[in-house]
């Protein structure tokens, strides 16, 4: 029992439990397909424990294997709307450093208005994750419809 | 190696590994949009280790950040059926205590017959999670098509 | 602080952090609906830490509760294509040993071109997971569109 107490007294950072859950702040300007995220208890149920935000993009602070998950819902959208607009695609990837640039997760909306997925991937300290939304429909900013997060799983 | 043995001898509860995976029991009466869940080894592959069921709703026993996930499939459904019965929406939220009531996760089926998603969210001991299905199509009770679960991730 | 260092010196295997993320290798021959997977750092961002591949199927090495996740995207697909080739279904299950054969996760594509889901399930050492894709559309081999993984969560 003493061990469990000792374990809880350790700073969580030393256990490597980096985790973040973000909500949509805004979309990028004309030629920038990136979504810009925000997080923190003042904003509701979003948070960052370990990772940080760098100009709205998520930067990793600890090497390891992470579970990356995302849901994006298009605003004012129906299956008819979706089919009447340019195909909307979401891609999550490492966008910096440039030497590690790669697409990790990609989904198209087709006639749907929401995409949601998750995957395990190795990430390194300093990796910045970008979420690129291409298409002409606006993503919802409702916090229960659009969110993005990572969870450190193991070294 | 001794440490690893010692760790495994600790009650898992002290490590905070609360986890549950539930299967659909039944839908609510006429004016009740909630899905009612069940879990336990006697039922198949569902289980509750830490959280409990309170009248078919999942109650959290340990504070922390949780990964909440859900999949719901509509029974006897095709894209034609789904579009004719639109809109069908699923929302997962904290429904009690009332002071903490909030929608955590929301998805519409549009022309599809299955929704699946997951997110990280802080939950507190005593929070009860409800899953509200609005629409006129019945959810499948097949255990590989409809399920709902939570996993404690960190304090 | 000494404890944290000691913990990190332990072999991760003893902590039970089995994890795998796989990419699609190929589909099966005519009468075999199974997808065949591959993993390893030489292939990109896929890996196996604990579980193993047995003829393209994932074999579990440690008893416990696992988070199983999958995303499959159909190649050269649009909502029109998908609806004309209906039904395409993906099922993840234990396929051996035969005595434990069961479907864990099932999704239909309907008018969409991607399915993605995840669930918690108990798995035992020796369980082999198979992913069966029925339908006439080929799955994409792009590593950001089609992947399959497991993560050990607790004993």
């Amino acid at each position: 029992q003493r061990f469990a107490q000792a374990q809880q007294q350790l700073p969580l950072e030393s256990l490597g439990w980096d985790v973040a859950e973000l909500q949509l702040n805004h979309t990028g300007p004309q030629q920038d397909p990136r979504l810009y995220w925000q997080g923190g208890p003042a904003l509701g149920r979003s948070f960052l424990h370990g990772p940080e935000l760098d100009k709205g993009q998520l930067r990793i602070h600890r090497d390891g294997i992470y579970m990356v998950h995302i849901q994006v819902t298009l605003a004012i959208c129906s299956s008819t709307t979706a089919s009447r607009h340019h195909p909307t695609t979401l891609a999550v990837g490492i966008c910096s450093p440039a030497s590690r640039s790669i697409s990790l997760l990609r989904l198209s909306f087709h006639q749907g208005c929401t995409i949601a997925s998750q995957r395990l991937t190795p990430l390194a300290r300093g990796d910045t994750l970008c979420t690129n939304l291409t298409g002409t429909l606006l993503p919802s900013r409702n916090t229960d419809e659009t969110f993005f997060g990572v969870q450190w799983v193991r070294p | 190696q001794r440490f690893a043995q010692a760790q495994q001898q600790l009650p898992l509860e002290s490590l905070g590994w609360d986890v549950a995976e539930l299967q659909l029991n039944h839908t609510g009466p006429q004016q009740d949009p909630r899905l009612y869940w069940q879990g336990g080894p006697a039922l198949g592959r569902s289980f509750l280790h830490g959280p409990e069921l309170d009248k078919g709703q999942l109650r959290i026993h340990r504070d922390g950040i949780y990964m909440v996930h859900i999949q719901v499939t509509l029974a006897i459904c095709s894209s034609t059926t789904a579009s004719r019965h639109h809109p069908t929406t699923l929302a997962v939220g904290i429904c009690s205590p009332a002071s903490r009531s909030i929608s955590l996760l929301r998805l519409s089926f549009h022309q599809g017959c299955t929704i699946a998603s997951q997110r990280l969210t802080p939950l507190a001991r005593g929070d009860t999670l409800c899953t509200n299905l609005t629409g006129t199509l019945l959810p499948s009770r097949n255990t590989d098509e409809t399920f709902f679960g939570v996993q404690w991730v960190r304090p | 602080q000494r404890f944290a260092q000691a913990q990190q010196q332990l072999p991760l295997e003893s902590l039970g952090w089995d994890v795998a993320e796989l990419q699609l290798n190929h589909t099966g021959p005519q009468q075999d609906p199974r997808l065949y997977w591959q993993g390893g750092p030489a292939l990109g961002r896929s890996f196996l830490h604990g579980p193993e591949l047995d003829k393209g199927q994932l074999r579990i090495h440690r008893d416990g509760i696992y988070m199983v996740h999958i995303q499959v995207t159909l190649a050269i697909c649009s909502s029109t294509t998908a609806s004309r080739h209906h039904p395409t279904t993906l099922a993840v299950g234990i396929c051996s040993p035969a005595s434990r054969s069961i479907s864990l996760l099932r999704l239909s594509f309907h008018q969409g071109c991607t399915i993605a889901s995840q669930r918690l399930t108990p798995l035992a050492r020796g369980d082999t997971l198979c992913t069966n894709l029925t339908g006439t559309l080929l799955p994409s081999r792009n590593t950001d569109e089609t992947f399959f993984g497991v993560q050990w969560v607790r004993p």
């Epitope: 979309t27 004309q30 004012i76 002409t136 | - | -």
Partner: antibody, heavy 119, light 111 residues
């Protein structure tokens, strides 16, 4: 640079039809919906409908549904708006317009085409 | 259809003074974390020009004396310091649902 260039002014008799063209340049034609908005002399703006050039699907304001047809020619990056059974109250300047990145508001406009319906 | 009511119909303001135009929607045009209200300026013989989108976002190239505010059903376009070149008709437009509709316009003149 995004440009929308419309066809010239038209004079039509009541009961006739008019077909106004809008030629797009400076961007990928099939990506962005083209909307049509009209303005009667000294009056406000009225949304008529839009077309997605990618597949030709159009959505019309219920007010014009029975009389308006929007089409596109991807080979010339041109959208057409045809209004039939013309009446005097259809006398207006007809604009084609395009949004910038997300649909819903119009950052680019054609120069307008005056359609006069008179017997 | 959502009806957009602009007020006043016309407005005379001295150069350098503030001009305020209101637009009321017959029902809320706010959803999904946005207010789907946009503002345009139109000068005689020209097509409308986008000034503000999503209630408060300034379109690129538009002077920052223009600003927008509001949510739900009530919205305001403000010109903080009227210039001679701001003489025009101003329209609000919603895109909450189809059909999109415009307000009747407000004519801004110099006093």
């Amino acid at each position: 640079e995004v440009q929308l260039v419309q066809s010239g002014a038209e004079v039509k008799k009541p009961g006739a039809s008019v077909k106004v063209s809008c030629k797009a340049s400076g961007y990928t034609f099939t990506t962005y919906n083209i909307h049509w908005v009209r303005q009667a002399p000294g009056q406000g703006l009225e949304w008529m409908g839009d077309i997605y050039p990618g597949n030709g699907d159009a959505s019309y304001n219920q007010k014009f549904r029975d009389r308006v047809t929007m089409t596109r020619d991807t080979s010339t990056s041109t959208v057409y708006m045809e209004l039939s059974s013309l009446r005097s109250e259809d006398t207006a300047v007809y604009y084609c317009a395009r949004f910038s990145r997300f649909d819903g508001w119009f950052a680019y406009w054609g120069q307008g085409t005056l359609v006069t319906v008179s017997s | 259809d959502i009806v957009m009511t602009q007020s006043p119909d016309s407005l005379a303001v001295s150069l350098g003074e503030r001009a305020t135009i209101n637009c009321r929607a017959s029902r809320s045009v706010s959803t999904s974390g946005y207010s789907y209200m946009h503002w345009y300026q139109q000068k005689p013989g020209q097509p409308p020009k986008l000034l503000i989108y999503l209630a408060s976002n300034l379109e690129s190239g538009v002077p920052d004396r223009f600003s927008g505010s509001g949510s739900g059903t009530d919205f305001t376009l403000t010109i903080s310091s009227l210039q001679a070149e701001d003489v025009a008709v101003y329209y609000c437009q919603h895109s909450r649902e189809l059909p999109y509709t415009f307000g009747g316009g407000t004519k801004v003149e110099i006093k």
